[in-house]
Interface confidence: medium
Amino acid sequence: LEVSESPGSVQVARGQTAVLPCAFSTSAALLNLNVIWMVIPLSNANQPEQVILYQGGQMFDGALRFHGRVGFTGTMPATNVSIFINNTQLSDTGTYQCLVNNLPDRGGRNIGVTGLTVLVPPSAPQCQIQGSQDLGSDVILLCSSEEGIPRPTYLWEKLDNTLKLPPTATQDQVQGTVTIRNISALSSGLYQCVASNAIGTSTCLLDLQVISPQPRSV
């Protein structure tokens, strides 16, 4: 019995269907086929879980969270024992193993391994201003998405004709911050943060209004 090499990893957007490949060759009839799919979850690597089982001609559910979402892609028994996972969730990310036995066929490699990564687009980021908006002050524009896998990067733009940030601004696309030093009237305006990763983008807006000091009355 020999399980075929499978592609190292599968990536899928959250909520979509993932297909995890596993196929084998055997010299025996598929009368005693036994297939166990296991996962080592990324979130809990010391607790492997059963995903789905096929033994004695019957299919059995694995861990509760897979119930009703997992099945074999083809009619069993078969030498293609790939599975699908519907409505993928973040917790499905992990290393999946198919363990195949088909007595009396012994020997050979009976395990296939495939990684699954569930990708999540950035959630709507939050835009905030830190610091005083008085003329001449320093302000920090903050942008952060609660969700996003891979981790989003953040791009700030000023929504005027140029889309350029003020010359006194420095941007950190990883942290999602823009520091604007010595703000002036020209710093006022609408700013947009674009959070993006491999599978999506999301934006938020922020209105910066620089406060000029009131002239003193004599």
Epitope: E49, Q58, A63, L64, R65, H67, G68, S91
Partner: antibody, heavy 120, light 108 residues
Framework: EVQLVESGGGLVKPGGSLRLSCAAS????????MSWVRQAPGKGLEWVGR??????????DYAAPVKGRFTISRDDSKNTLYLQMNSLKTEDTAVYYC???????????WGQGTLVTVSS | SYELTQPPSVSVSPGQTASITCSGD??????ASWYQQKPGQSPVLVIY???KRPSGIPERFSGSNSGNTATLTISGTQAEDEADYYC???????????FGGGTKLTVL
């Protein structure tokens, strides 16, 4: 050591509302699916509803008799499970248990229960 | 709606074997769990996934599940085993949980 401690039970009039809490400790609460189960005096166990972990979607399911009246929620930052009960009926009188769902489906840990009495 | 049926009561002499059944349509296609509940106490899981025993549960407790019936077997029953026993099944499609009506085990 896993611990689940319910609170918030008491006497309430029909049509009234009550919120039960369940404080969890001894395990990673944010990864756990949690349920409420109730037991009317002298009767059997009855499943009320369940909430998945946030990473599993955070969705809820409810038993038919409480659907639309009861709401299960969780605050992972406080390791606390909630049961908001509205439009209470006399038949909702029971001891309410919070329980953790084992990865393979059964409830592996239970709280001590809190009594809810709905009476005029 | 799905129902699980248990006998209301079962009696057994100390040291003998007690069997408690739980019946439901094609129950053997689902996993069954069993709980023990003593008066004034919370339920305790004694069997899950048809036949698995959680740590701390004595070996005299065993379970099986096939066809339409799951069975909890207590061999060498002891006085401390006197309690109510509930079966449970998880319904994957609806996401709901169903308990049996419970069986009172009396150790004579």
């Amino acid at each position: 050591e896993v611990q689940l401690v319910e609170s918030g039970g008491g006497l309430v009039k029909p049509g009234g509302s009550l919120r039960l809490s369940c404080a969890a400790s001894g395990f990673t609460f944010s990864n756990a699916w949690m349920s409420w189960v109730r037991q009317a005096p002298g009767k059997g166990l009855e499943w009320v509803g369940r909430i998945k972990s946030k990473t599993d979607g955070g969705t809820t399911d409810y038993a038919a008799p409480v659907k639309g009246r009861f709401t299960i929620s969780r605050d992972d930052s406080k390791n606390t499970l909630y049961l908001q009960m509205n439009s209470l009926k006399t038949e909702d009188t029971a001891v309410y248990y919070c329980a953790r769902l084992h990865i393979y489906g059964p409830f592996d840990y239970w709280g001590q229960g809190t009594l809810v009495t709905v009476s005029s | 709606s799905y129902e699980l049926t248990q006998p209301p009561s079962v009696s057994v002499s100390p040291g003998q074997t007690a069997s408690i059944t739980c019946s439901g349509d094609k129950l053997g296609d689902k996993y069954a769990s069993w709980y023990q509940q003593k008066p004034g106490q919370s339920p305790v899981l004694v069997i899950y996934q048809d036949s698995k025993r959680p740590s701390g549960i004595p070996e005299r407790f065993s379970g099986s599940n096939s066809g339409n019936t799951a069975t909890l077997t207590i061999s060498g029953t002891q006085a401390e085993d006197e309690a109510d026993y509930y079966c449970l099944s998880y319904l994957a499609r609806s996401g709901s949980v169903v308990f049996g009506g419970g069986t009172k085990l009396t150790v004579l």
